[in-house]
Interface confidence: low
């Protein structure tokens, strides 16, 4: 339904607080380098303008699109060219090209300082002194570092952030109360950001059809009692929401997400029996809860899939009449019967089925041709099952840190051209699959592990896209969204790689390592491990283990020494020499 003033419509729907928060997120995700104060000023100006349009929708400029209004506002930033270089050229374009231009300049790895957490008392004072500014700062800092963060969900995180400070700043032991909550929000936030990044990559790189297929599979697993028509409606609405958020249309996205939550709760009887608790919550919690809700129980006595999709003589007729609808029904029926499969496996099965029908429906005897199509699924199902079994065994044997190290070595040998920080970050996250998923029973392992790996490998893909250094990474990332993980799993050692020259500086460590947290110390050691593999890609596991054990002992010894710096200098030289000898460098 058309509105005379889009900005007034969204302001009224969302309310002033959410409107301001979402505009701040939008601006921070576009202009990631701009100071907080500049963004607040822009947001206040937009908000004042929106209020004039609420008062009179016919007022000057109130009929302009949100992209036009927001783009014009962003283009008033005085230092645009100095700070953003060529991004300033976006301002010479007209909508919709201007917005597309801004989107293309979003940086997944912006040059921003690491967020350092101040002392608890300092934070509590800042929170009490100016709660509004404190919370805006949170939105700004997260949004600029995560330019694809799902904006309505970030509002939910901010609400929890506020609740944590409200509760803990009054507690007897503020730190004991607050720090675990902030750690949890940080970890959940990173996971949420990465999951949304995959959704946006799916839409932007592989198109709406790919995203809809993913959504059909996931919603069918989650709501197996819902009719196909109901799942299709939810998929259409969900696709609209994510298309908007990934496109920077955050006000529309948040508004449509609220409408979708309302619809789901009004129709929960025909969707899922698991929604009752979610639907009793306030809006932000409700939407989050629905997105995370557990799978409903499968209906009893579901008939065999073969009857409709293999044995029926009408398979080719049905397929020809409406290909995507028929394939959607296949995916729906298969997914609702298999909550134990990953979404990407279900999509591989659907792709195999589609390829078979394309070939067989043009054959002399179609039925004879596709009769054994389900037999082709067996190896596709067994491959992730076996991989997860092997890797969970390895994880249980090694523990998380050493399992990460095994993956670091594995992936550095596969794609040694990738920068060391990226290899460390991605391999550490890949390694977290163990503690996240291996504890689950067999029936939940694959959806947990393989769909999580899809999220992590997408991080590698988006970082690599900015700096393409490996044809193998480009190939695995771009050929097929659902086959990314099997593609990376299948990569062997890159025999074409010319080992990096040895640089002693890379392996020089100082006393500052002693004051690092355990996590940061691990990252230092893992960075050294990647560099070792880049210098000596043919090093055996045993050689690398020996060097890393020596390195751990060296750090432990020097951190206990009276003169730490001298110890690091002298023992470090010996360690480098011993490592070179051990690895034949």
């Amino acid at each position: 339904d058309a509105h005379k003033s889009e900005v007034a419509h969204r302001f009224k729907d969302l309310g002033e607080e959410n409107f301001k928060a979402l505009v701040l997120i939008a601006f921070a995700q576009y202009l990631q380098q701009c100071p907080f104060e500049d963004h607040v000023k822009l947001v206040n100006e937009v908000t004042e303008f929106a209020k004039t349009c609420v008062a009179d929708e016919s007022a000057e400029n109130c009929d302009k699109s949100l992209h036009t209004l927001f783009g014009d506002k962003l283009c008033t930033v005085a230092t645009l060219r100095e700070t953003y270089g060529e991004m300033a050229d976006c301002c010479a374009k007209q909508e919709p090209e201007r917005n597309e231009c801004f989107l293309q300049h979003k940086d997944d790895n912006p040059n921003l300082p690491r967020l350092v957490r101040p002392e608890v008392d300092v934070m509590c004072t800042a929170f009490h002194d100016n709660e509004e500014t404190f919370l805006k700062k949170y939105l700004y800092e997260i949004a600029r570092r995560h330019p694809y963060f799902y904006a309505p969900e970030l509002l939910f995180f901010a609400k929890r952030y506020k609740a944590a400070f409200t509760e803990c700043c009054q507690a007897a032991d503020k730190a004991a109360c607050l720090l675990p909550k902030l750690d949890e929000l940080r970890d959940e936030g990173k996971a949420s950001s990465a999951k949304q990044r995959l959704k946006c990559a799916s839409l932007q790189k592989f198109g709406e059809r790919a995203f809809k297929a993913w959504a059909v599979a996931r919603l069918s697993q989650r709501f197996p009692k819902a009719e196909f028509a109901e799942v299709s409606k939810l998929v259409t609405d969900l696709t609209k929401v994510h298309t908007e958020c990934c496109h920077g249309d955050l006000l529309e996205c948040a508004d449509d997400r609220a409408d979708l939550a309302k619809y789901i709760c009004e129709n929960q009887d025909s969707i899922s029996s698991k929604l009752k608790e979610c639907c009793e919550k306030p809006l932000l919690e409700k939407s989050h809860c629905i997105a995370e809700v557990e799978n409903d129980e499968m209906p009893a006595d579901l008939p065999s899939l073969a009857a409709d999709f293999v044995e029926s003589k009408d398979v080719c007729k049905n397929y020809a009449e409406a290909k995507d609808v028929f394939l959607g029904m296949f995916l729906y029926e298969y997914a609702r019967r298999h909550p134990d499969y990953s979404v990407v496996l279900l999509l591989r099965l659907a792709k195999t089925y589609e390829t078979t029908l394309e070939k067989c429906c043009a054959a002399a005897d179609p039925h004879e041709c596709y009769a054994k199509v389900f037999d082709e699924f067996k190896p596709l199902v067994e491959e992730p099952q076996n991989l997860i079994k092997q890797n969970c065994e390895l994880f249980e044997q090694l523990g998380e840190y050493k399992f990460q190290n095994a993956l670091l070595v594995r992936y550095t040998k596969k794609v040694p051209q990738v920068s060391t920080p990226t290899l460390v970050e991605v391999s550490r996250n890949l390694g977290k699959v163990g503690s996240k998923c291996c504890k689950h029973p067999e029936a939940k392992r694959m959806p947990c592990a393989e769909d999580y790996l899809s999220v992590v490998l997408n991080q590698l893909c988006v970082l690599h896209e900015k700096t393409p250094v490996s044809d193998r990474v480009t190939k695995c990332c771009t050929e097929s969204l659902v086959n990314r993980r099997p593609c990376f799993s299948a990569l062997e050692v890159d025999e074409t790689y010319v080992p990096k020259e040895f640089n002693a500086e890379t392996f020089t460590f100082h006393a500052d390592i002693c004051t690092l947290s355990e996590k940061e110390r691990q990252i230092k050691k893992q960075t050294a491990l990647v560099e070792l593999v880049k210098h000596k890609p043919k090093a055996t596991k045993e050689q690398l283990k020996a060097v890393m054990d020596d390195f751990a002992a060296f750090v432990e010894k020097c951190c206990k020494a009276d003169d730490k710096e001298t110890c690091f200098a002298e023992e470090g030289k010996k360690l480098v020499a011993a490592s070179q000898a051990a690895l034949g460098l």
């Epitope: 270089g85 790895n109 040059n111 060391t420 700096t467």
Partner: nanobody
Framework: EVQLLESGGGLVQPGGSLRLSCAAS????????VAWFRQAPGKGREFVAG????????YYADSVKGRFTISRDNSKNTLYLQMNSLRPEDTAVYYC???????????????????WGQGTLVTVSS
Amino acid sequence: EVQLLESGGGLVQPGGSLRLSCAASGRYIDETAVAWFRQAPGKGREFVAGIGGGVDITYYADSVKGRFTISRDNSKNTLYLQMNSLRPEDTAVYYCAARPGRPLITSKQADLYPYWGQGTLVTVSS
């Protein structure tokens, strides 16, 4: 810490070509925004061309657009400036500068670059 070492400068006739190189050590060049600046006698440092960290988006000063090309070879950890159709007003000491942390953009502001080479002299004269 990033060390930068320029080479390739020299004397060239108007209309001629030169290729400047800037070898980086201490950090991968693909992880930094890098740029060429120049300083003519008695003038301030002027931005010539830049390339983003983590993405090959290039930027040029209007005065060199269409004549100069900036590129980098990640495997050699080296930045290049191919200069064609050189003019006498291109005479200057050319510096390469780096801004680590994978900034997508390069800035034309010299003071945002913490690392600089020692410079290489380019003279365009008949």
